[in-house]
């Protein structure tokens, strides 16, 4: 390897070496290295093999090191952002309103008007804007799957608030799924969690775009907060690695 | 600020300046700066702006960009497992076997020999092996919080599997709490997801440790893969960062 | 990525991990861990090019800044990026201990 | 940490992360970017002692080890930690745009 | 002030048996292996054996097994080291060391002489 | 058993002087080779462990080097307090074993 003066690579091996001396003592908060006289004999307990195996073994379900950002997503995203089709639609007469559930649907064709291939979205939220909520409520976030059955996403516990709040959650994969599909209404369900044995399953939370009865001006305004997807994507002439410095559209 | 040689901090304020330059101009893959003639006098349009605002506000369940490493992470955790209470234990008799749920608990004064204090707990998991699965299932974890009643803690999408795989839950803030009360047993609940509507809750998974008649070698081996809580802590002699170079106990 | 799968197979000379594994008896003379008996640590090493500066051709570096020094610094240094814990089996007195030590293990390096 | 709360505001010589406000219009002569006008970048600057060799009197190190060279670098280097995303907006031509840079802005550094 | 306090000088016959006391303060007396050395007249330093206070787990040197006795009383925080069937080049001054597991003895006692004569 | 073998048995020298002693053992000990200083009447002190670590409140004229089997303890400027016997002790293996002593005494 060379910059300016040449790389003594032995040299830089000796000193990281040397380095990892004092890296494995100081995390250890060892003056200087155990002494091995009173080490009992023969192998390592089973135990405590055991016990470094399991250390060292990733298990499912267990977060890995953070991956390194992968070169994409160095470059800039475009923001844009779909709201909800609105409630009047004829697609919400589909589902029965219940006391634990509301839904939400997107056309997916403005979906695509604004990430023309799944390949260039690099995040996708769903924000709703939650009331005032008075008591603690866990709710899940469900995908529409086929006719009338639905995938499970995620869940939040929502503490109590005086005052509105946007939730995000984070539906990437959905989305890209979407946009590969050909589909031209999907949509989510935001339920109470019900447990097994528990009998009181109302979703108490209040939406923002579900309320009824509004007239005039508040009702835009409403309209205007009704849940909406957030994207971020690669624009496609970025993607396409042009080498023309031209500003495209 | 002097090194060897005196540092310019209006050099290395220039140099990075013009690093910007770069830095923006490259990840939005542009040549040079768009040209601004074609651009509609007056402010932004209130969309463009709202769009910003929202990209610009964290919103409630975003993550945050991750926080640096605490001091404390920086040094080596000393790595012990405490097992489950043995299923045959009469805590158990207390909770009825149902299709649904099954349970673990644990004896606190176990926890409290390996993690003497709760701010040295840096980190706890459940870990459990589940034996081989046909179906898709998901999972819930509960703690149990008083007492008949049990707290959500997180959930699991298991994949249909072949195999045995350790299962892992971050349970760090749970077993924090118990290391801080005065319980002599404290416990968890896997279940079954239940969905609001959903008359099929029976929990399909097969826990190692729960399975019934097993006999000699056998039910020691599976015995000792049975659930257990596996423990990172700071060492008591550790924390108290004394300026002595001992190598305590 | 500058990672392990890359700069392992390529002659890169800029930024890159480096192959390095210790062997904890033979590199640092130490008996006194008992598993692992050496691991991969790796380190980051060689240049990375400033290519940013008013009188330079914008185009032309503009492929090239993401790699050399996409955190905009004044002097960009090559560094770890992913790094992975290690844990430890080693004796205090006659007492086996298993301890952790977080971010031992580079697996990817960066200009930052 | 070495972060903004406590850079600035006490007079560390050492790595650490320093205060940059780059407003786009006075430093960078562009009138491009409609919003914001300007953002806190920062950036890390100052020495990270190599503190370790085979003669170094190890109880004397340990305690400054994690802040110079928590990585083990053989030649450790102060950079940015924690960094934050800065959304733009842009015309180009008559269209506006919201776009999101990742790691624009240094909250913290450190010597890797 | 971490402090090792021993018992003051003995004389004693041949086939006699002598023991030493040796007071530990300043420190959890627990959490540390004692160790006796001892030093005869004009000679280094020889290591008889260890005992670990918490579990009153001991080891000796082959050349005292079975003439010496360790043994502690967690409530005082002292250890004993009894040595049995003396002979005249037992004649020596006795020393509980503190043991630190980077391998080195960090605080000693004051030494105790003791003279066996007939 | 690890036998270690202190060179020279005594020593005479000036205040001011720089001193050498060295320790040699029958076989490779991993730097665990400690030095302590007795004074007659004095508890025995501990001056270097881990071969080159210098105990809390030890003068830094005191230093410690080597590796392997050969291990070296110097004293760089004597002061009148310095003059006592020292002795090596190796940590590596059971049992522990002492070298026989060097005395230092004023020229």
């Known amino acids: 390897l060379s910059t300016c003066k040449t790389i003594d690579m032995e040299l830089v091996k000796r000193k990281r070496i040397e380095a990892i001396r004092g890296q494995i003592l100081s995390k250890l908060r060892l003056a200087s290295p155990p002494s091995q006289g009173e080490v009992p004999p023969g192998p390592l307990p089973e135990a405590v093999l055991a016990l470094y195996n399991s250390t060292r073994d990733r298990v499912a379900g267990e977060s890995a090191e953070p991956e390194p950002e992968p070169e994409a997503d160095y470059y800039a995203k475009e923001v844009t952002r779909v709201l909800m089709v609105e409630t009047h639609n004829e697609i919400y007469d589909k589902f029965k309103q219940s006391t634990h559930s509301i839904y939400m649907f997107f056309n997916t064709s403005e979906l695509r008007e604004a990430v023309p291939e799944p390949v260039l979205l690099s995040r996708a939220e769903l924000r709703l804007l939650r009331l005032k909520l008075k008591v603690e409520q866990h709710v899940e976030l469900y995908q529409k799957y086929s006719n009338n059955s639905w995938r499970y996403l995620s869940n939040r516990l929502l503490a109590p608030s005086d005052s509105p709040e946007w939730l995000s959650f984070d539906v990437t994969g959905v989305v890209r799924q979407w946009l590969s599909r050909g589909g031209e209404i999907e949509g989510f369900r935001l339920s109470a969690h019900c447990s097994c044995d528990s009998r009181d399953n109302t979703l108490q939370v209040d939406i923002n775009g579900f309320t009824t009865g509004r007239r005039g001006d508040l009702a835009t305004i409403h309209g205007m907060n009704r849940p909406f997807l957030l994207l971020m994507a690669t624009p496609l002439e970025r993607a396409q690695h042009l080498q023309s410095s031209r500003h495209r559209r | 600020l002097s090194t060897c040689k005196t540092i310019d901090m209006e050099l290395v304020k220039r140099k990075r300046i013009e690093a910007i330059r770069g830095q923006i101009l490259s990840k939005l893959r542009l040549a040079s700066p768009p040209s601004q003639g074609e651009v509609p006098p007056g402010p932004l349009p209130e969309a463009v702006l709202a769009l910003y605002n929202s990209t610009r506000d964290r919103v409630a369940g975003e993550s945050a960009e991750p926080e640096p490493e605490p001091e404390a992470d920086y040094y080596a955790k000393e790595v012990t497992r405490v097992l489950m209470v043995e299923t045959h234990n009469e805590i158990y008799d207390k909770f009825k076997q149902s299709t649904h749920s099954i349970y673990m608990f644990f004896n606190t004064s176990e926890l409290r020999e390996a993690v003497p204090e709760p701010v040295l707990l840096s980190r706890a998991e459940l870990r459990l092996l589940r034996l081989k699965l046909k179906v898709e299932q998901h999972v819930e974890l509960y703690q149990k919080y008083s007492n008949n009643s049990w707290r959500y803690l997180s959930n699991r999408l298991l994949a249909p599997s072949d195999s045995p795989e350790w299962l892992s839950f971050d349970v760090t803030g749970v077993v924090r709490q118990w290391l801080s009360r005065g319980g002599e047993i404290e416990g968890f609940r896997l279940s079954a997801h239940c969905s609001c509507d959903s008359r099929d809750n029976t929990l399909q998974v097969d826990i190692n440790g729960f399975t019934t008649g097993r006999r000699g070698d056998l039910a020691t081996i599976h015995g000792m893969n049975r659930p257990f809580l596996l423990l990172m802590a700071t060492p008591l002699e550790r924390a108290q960062h004394l300026q002595s170079s001992r190598h305590r106990r | 990525a500058l990672d392990t799968n890359y700069c392992f197979s390529s002659t890169e000379k800029n930024c890159c991990v480096r192959q390095l594994y210790i062997d904890f008896r033979k590199d640092l003379g130490w008996k006194w861990i008992h598993e692992p008996k050496g691991y991969h640590a790796n380190f980051c090493l060689g240049p990375c090019p400033y290519i940013w500066s008013l009188d330079t051709q914008y185009s032309k570096v503009l492929a090239l800044y993401n790699q050399h020094n996409p955190g905009a610094s004044a002097a960009p240094c090559c560094v770890p990026q992913a790094l992975e814990p290690l844990p430890i089996v080693y004796y205090v007195g006659r007492k086996p201990k298993v301890e952790q030590l977080s971010n031992m293990i580079v697996r990817s390096c960066k200009c930052s | 940490a070495l972060d903004t709360n406590y850079c600035f505001s006490s007079t560390e010589k050492n790595c650490c992360v320093r205060q940059l406000y780059i407003d786009f219009r006075k430093d960078l002569g562009w009138k491009w970017i409609h919003e914001p006008k300007g953002y806190h970048a920062n950036f890390c600057l100052g020495p990270c002692p190599y503190i370790w060799s085979l003669d170094t009197q190890y109880s004397k190190v340990l305690a400054l080890y994690n802040q110079h060279n928590p990585g083990a670098s053989a030649a450790p280097c102060c950079v940015p930690q924690a960094l934050e995303p800065l959304p733009i907006v842009y015309y180009v031509g008559r269209k506006p745009k919201v776009e999101q840079l990742s790691n624009m802005i240094v909250r913290s550094c450190k010597c890797s | 002030e971490v402090q090792l306090v021993q018992s003051g000088a003995e004389v004693k016959k041949p086939g006699a048996s002598v023991k030493v006391s040796c007071k530990a303060s300043g420190y959890t007396f627990t959490s540390y292996d004692m160790h006796w050395v001892r030093q005869a007249p004009g000679q280094g330093l020889e290591w008889m054996g260890r005992i670990d206070p918490q579990s009153g787990g001991v080891k000796y040197a082959q050349k005292f097994q079975g003439r010496a006795t360790l043994t502690v009383d967690t409530s005082t925080s002292t250890a004993y080291m009894e040595l049995s069937r003396l002979r005249s080049d037992d004649t020596a001054v006795y020393y509980c060391a503190r043991w630190d597991y980077g391998g080195y003895f960090d605080v000693w006692g004051q030494g105790t002489l003791v003279t066996v004569s007939s | 058993d690890i036998q270690m073998t202190q060179s020279p048995s005594s020593l005479s020298a000036s205040v001011g002087d720089r001193v050498t002693i060295t320790c040699r053992a029958s076989?490779?000990?991993?730097?665990?080779l400690n030095w302590y200083q007795q004074k007659p009447g004095k508890a025995v002190k501990l001056l270097i462990y881990y071969t080159s670590v210098l105990e809390t409140g030890v003068p830094s004229r005191f230093s410690g080097s080597g590796s392997g089997t050969d291990y070296t303890l110097t004293i760089s400027s004597l002061q009148p307090e310095d003059f006592a016997t020292y002795f090596c002790?190796?940590?590596?293996?059971?049992?522990?074993?002492f070298g026989q002593g060097t005395k230092l005494e004023i020229k």
């Open positions: 002790q190796q940590g590596d293996e059971l049992p522990w074993t």
């Open positions: 076989q490779d000990i991993y730097n665990y």
